[in-house]
Amino acid sequence: TLNSVLNSNAIKNLPPPLGGAAGHPGSAVSAAPGILYPGGNKYQTIDNYQPYPCAEDEECGTDEYCASPTRGGDAGVQICLACRKRRKRCMRHAMCCPGNYCKNGICVSSDQNHFRGEIEETITESFGNDHSTLDGYSRRTTLSSKMYHTKGQEGSVCLRSSDCASGLCCARHFWSKICKPVLKEGQVCTKHRRKGSHGLEIFQRCYCGEGLSCRIQKDHHQASNSSRLHTCQRH
């Protein structure tokens, strides 16, 4: 959860007008040291912050992407990095700032007039593209709202889960992403023990459905760490 990285996140937000603790994440009882900034103008936010650890783009803000901070760095150490502006180099759509997408390794403007054909090419030709850029406000809203009338069915190529029909999620399959079924109660799920570990999966499972969480199967508690089976279980 977010609390696990609070201590490494050095944003210091000032107390809110209602006098409570920082609203997201944390509370009066769980805010980590350094989150609240004492004194001063309460409507000022100090924006010099340390990088936020992440495992995938979806954990970062809409103007960020998740990657190793150093070229060729350890895949397990990833942080949220500022998105790349137009004409900067990229490897996938999520790296480009809102209003842009990744075309032939360069962030280009997502001009609606020629975007449809290009994005369809890019989905099929790119390595691990995670998100498209469709408008100036949010590059990670659904593809279907702009270009497709129907949501992707099981096996359809997708960029993110909102491209898929209800009950499906967008998950990695070899080096592209396709719509796969959201996991049901009792189905085996993947619990990532360390940040960044699911960047290595080439057959990614969906997450557990609503009301379910990925937990160790009760009769596997005695098994060794490496062989523990996780299944989707009711909260």
């Epitope: 959860t1 977010l2 609070l6 996140n9 944003i11 937000n13 000032l14 107390p15 809110p16 007008p17 209602l18 409570g20 920082a22 609203g23 997201h24 994440p25 944390g26 989150i35 309460k42 409507y43 936010t45 912050y49 936020y52 992440c54 995938e56 979806e58 954990e59 970062c60 803000g61 809409t62 103007d63 960020e64 949220c80 406000y137 949010s138 990670r140 809203t141 659904t142 993110r160 909102s162």
Partner: nanobody, 125 residues
Framework: EVQLVESGGGLVQAGGSLRLSCTAS????????VGWFRQAPGKEREFVTA????????DYADSVKGRFTISRDNAKNTAYLQMSSLKPEDTAVYYC??????????????????WGQGTQVTVSS
């Protein structure tokens, strides 16, 4: 501009469950952090839980961890708060709020720029 409307509140016995919904109008919802706050009579409004734009990051106040679950469906422009094992001290007006999620960081309460009108949750003993 995002308008938020909460629903699903009501009267429930201690130990029971409720599911609150927060339905948004406006395209900015899918790019927003969504948070739930609550305010009990005579008390300050307090943070309950929050979820980032994609649903990949969530956080909970210690008082509700393990009992409450936040989720969202961007296709339906809706966020949910599943509340179980309810206690009398959970009685409050529950507010849904949304704010910009451009950067992965902590939001203070005043940075939630859109707020719903609230829905009453009463837990009887």
């Amino acid at each position: 501009e995002v308008q938020l409307v909460e629903s699903g509140g009501g009267l429930v016995q201690a130990g029971g469950s409720l599911r609150l919904s927060c339905t948004a109008s406006g395209s900015a919802f899918s790019s927003s952090v969504v948070g739930w706050f609550r305010q009990a009579p005579g008390k300050e409004r307090e943070f309950v839980t929050a979820i980032n734009w994609s649903g990949a990051r969530t956080d909970y106040a210690d008082s509700v961890k393990g009992r409450f679950t936040i989720s969202r469906d961007n296709a339906k422009n809706t966020a949910y708060l599943q509340m179980s094992s309810l206690k009398p001290e959970d009685t409050a007006v529950y507010y849904c709020a949304a704010g910009s999620d451009r950067y992965a960081r902590v939001l203070t309460e005043y940075e939630y720029v859109w707020w719903g009108q609230g829905t009453q949750v009463t837990v009887s003993s």
